[in-house]
């Protein structure tokens, strides 16, 4: 069994999340999971996920009672979502930490814009995505 | 010429974002952006800049000289980084819009911590994947 | 209330051309993409083109791609179906469609149709 | 390429319930929002349910959609069947660059 398991368990009890009323009104992240099978579309959707967790997470880092079980499920989250990757790891953090409302921070984004907009459709690997591609770039409407 | 790229230079002018200073001090995704050449990696950075992104108009939805801009550019990342599905777009929004603060929210989460974990390691299709998985199994320290 | 009315159906010789229109009122037309659906005579409905809300992205079925060209005036509130080399499979009655989104997304709502009829 | 199969017809009595099947051909159908359209004979069309199981305003909630992930597939239901139920009813999706539709199909109340 996974070591998160049992410090799960232990979390459910702390926010008193083991009731079947917590059900009620459906699910924040299973269903939405439910619906993308493509991997990066997954990937889309954890991404966002797993930065809930950390925030989640940084609200109680300084409750002794729930700190062991809260780490070893970060370091889990770490091997599974991060491939043990501390470079990944931390890239994903940078990201999450910026402040929205910092100015200098909007000016770089906004600097970035472009070049970011460019990278955003999927890179043209296989045949059929390639195919696609040609078509979207075929279909833009000239200006 | 994509349309967001005009729209993306009005931008750089309402902000004051077209000069070389914006540089300094490196950039805040692009360089992030070089580091990761696999889809599913890129997906989980690019769904983080995105997120920003959307939070940063957001903040400046009431500012008339940009709402064209702005809407132009929210258009074509959803084209690009959505592929024009609303579903896809929809689930998204409602990951960045959970308030991580919500106590319901919260319990939820923590409910659902398990099942999300049991999801976060990409299917072992490959070969390869499937090879380092055992291994990563293999190297657990025991709990 | 939303409304879609279509116009500029008619007969046509094949190898001709013809323009649709489609005068949209009740929402904000820059904020939609817009669709064209056409229905042969006793047939099903199938899909021909869409646009996004600012004109920026085009999207067509194979069976018109390089023949038709969808457009957009959002200063009239308007959409446009160029038909070009028409053929006698193209006649249907075409109706324009509003889509709940500005990148595609769901048709809901239909303008009541035009028939364009390609005939020798 | 992506399809959409519907029954080519239905029928059932007034009062009753009918409910009416749409499959995807590939992938999962959960990944796209599903619609159904409804059409008179000599009429338009006309949205009956968008965004799998959402009712535009004028609908009455005999309509319903849902999508069932296990089977791949969505359904419309109508209860309380009434004669001016009887249509042509159409699915839809899109598939990452094409609406595309199911072959339709026709409600009869008895």
């Known amino acids: 069994q996974d070591p998160y398991v049992k410090e799960a368990e232990n979390l459910k009890k702390y926010f008193n999340a083991g009731h079947s009323d917590v059900a009620d009104n459906g699910t924040l992240f299973l269903g939405i999971l439910k619906n993308w099978k493509e991997e990066s579309d997954r990937k889309i959707m954890q991404s966002q996920i797993v930065s809930f967790y950390f925030k989640l997470f940084k609200n109680f880092k300084d409750d002794q009672s729930i700190q062991k079980s809260v780490e070893t499920i970060k370091e889990d989250m770490n091997v599974k979502f991060f491939n043990s990757n501390k470079k990944k790891r931390d890239d994903f953090e940078k990201l999450t930490n910026y402040s929205v409302t910092d100015l200098n921070v909007q000016r770089k984004a906004i600097h970035e814009l472009i070049q970011v907009m460019a990278e955003l459709s999927p890179a043209a690997k296989t045949g059929k995505r390639k195919r696609s591609q040609m078509l979207f770039r075929g279909r833009r409407a000239s200006q | 010429q994509d349309p967001y790229v005009k729209e993306a230079e009005n931008l750089k002018k309402y902000f004051n974002a077209g000069h070389s200073d914006v540089a300094d001090n490196g950039t805040l995704f692009l360089g992030i952006l070089k580091n990761w050449k696999e889809e599913s990696d890129r997906k989980i950075m690019q769904s983080q800049i995105v997120s920003f992104y959307f939070k940063l108009f957001k903040n400046f939805k009431d500012d008339q000289s940009i709402q064209k801009s702005v809407e132009t550019i929210k258009e074509d990342m959803n084209v690009k980084f959505f592929n024009s599905n609303k579903k896809k777009r929809d689930d998204f929004e409602k990951l960045t819009n959970y308030s991580v603060t919500d106590l319901n929210v919260q319990r939820k989460a923590i409910h659902e911590l398990i099942q999300v974990m049991a999801e976060l390691s990409p299917a072992a299709k490959t070969g390869k994947r499937k090879r380092s998985q055992m291994l990563f199994r293999g190297r657990r320290a025991s709990q | 209330d939303v409304q879609l009315v279509e116009t500029g159906g008619g007969l046509v010789q094949p190898g001709g051309s013809l323009r649709l229109s489609c005068a949209a009122s009740?929402?904000?037309?820059?904020?939609?993409?817009m669709s064209w659906v056409r229905q042969a005579p006793g047939k099903g409905l199938e899909w021909v083109s869409a646009?996004?809300?600012?004109?920026?992205?085009?999207y067509y079925a194979d069976s018109v791609k390089g023949r038709f060209t969808i457009s957009r005036d959002n200063s009239k509130n308007t959409l446009y179906l160029q038909m070009d080399s028409l053929r006698a499979e193209d006649t249907a009655v075409y109706y324009c469609?509003?889509?709940?989104?500005?990148?595609?997304?769901?048709?809901?709502?239909w303008g009541q149709g035009n028939l364009v009829t390609v005939s020798s | 390429n992506f399809m959409l199969t519907q029954p080519h017809s239905v029928s059932e009595s007034p009062g009753k319930t009918v409910t009416i099947s749409c499959t995807g051909s590939?992938?999962?159908?959960?990944?796209?929002?599903v619609q159904w359209y409804q059409q008179r004979p000599g009429s338009a069309p006309t949205t009956v349910i968008y965004?799998?199981?959402?009712?535009p305003s004028g609908v009455p909630p005999r309509f319903s959609g849902s999508i069932d992930r296990s089977s791949n597939s969505a359904s419309l239901t109508i209860s309380g069947l009434k004669s001016e139920d009887e249509a042509d009813y159409y699915c839809?999706?899109?598939?990452?660059?094409?609406?595309?539709f199911g072959g339709g199909t026709k409600l009869t109340v008895l």
């Open positions: 839809q999706s899109y598939d990452g660059s094409a609406w595309v």
């Open positions: 965004e799998d199981n959402q009712r």
């Open positions: 646009i996004s809300g600012s004109g920026g992205s085009t």
């Open positions: 590939s992938g999962s159908i959960a990944s796209n929002y």
């Open positions: 469609a509003k889509t709940s989104w500005n990148a595609g997304g769901p048709i809901d709502y």
């Open positions: 009740g929402f904000t037309f820059s904020s939609y993409a």
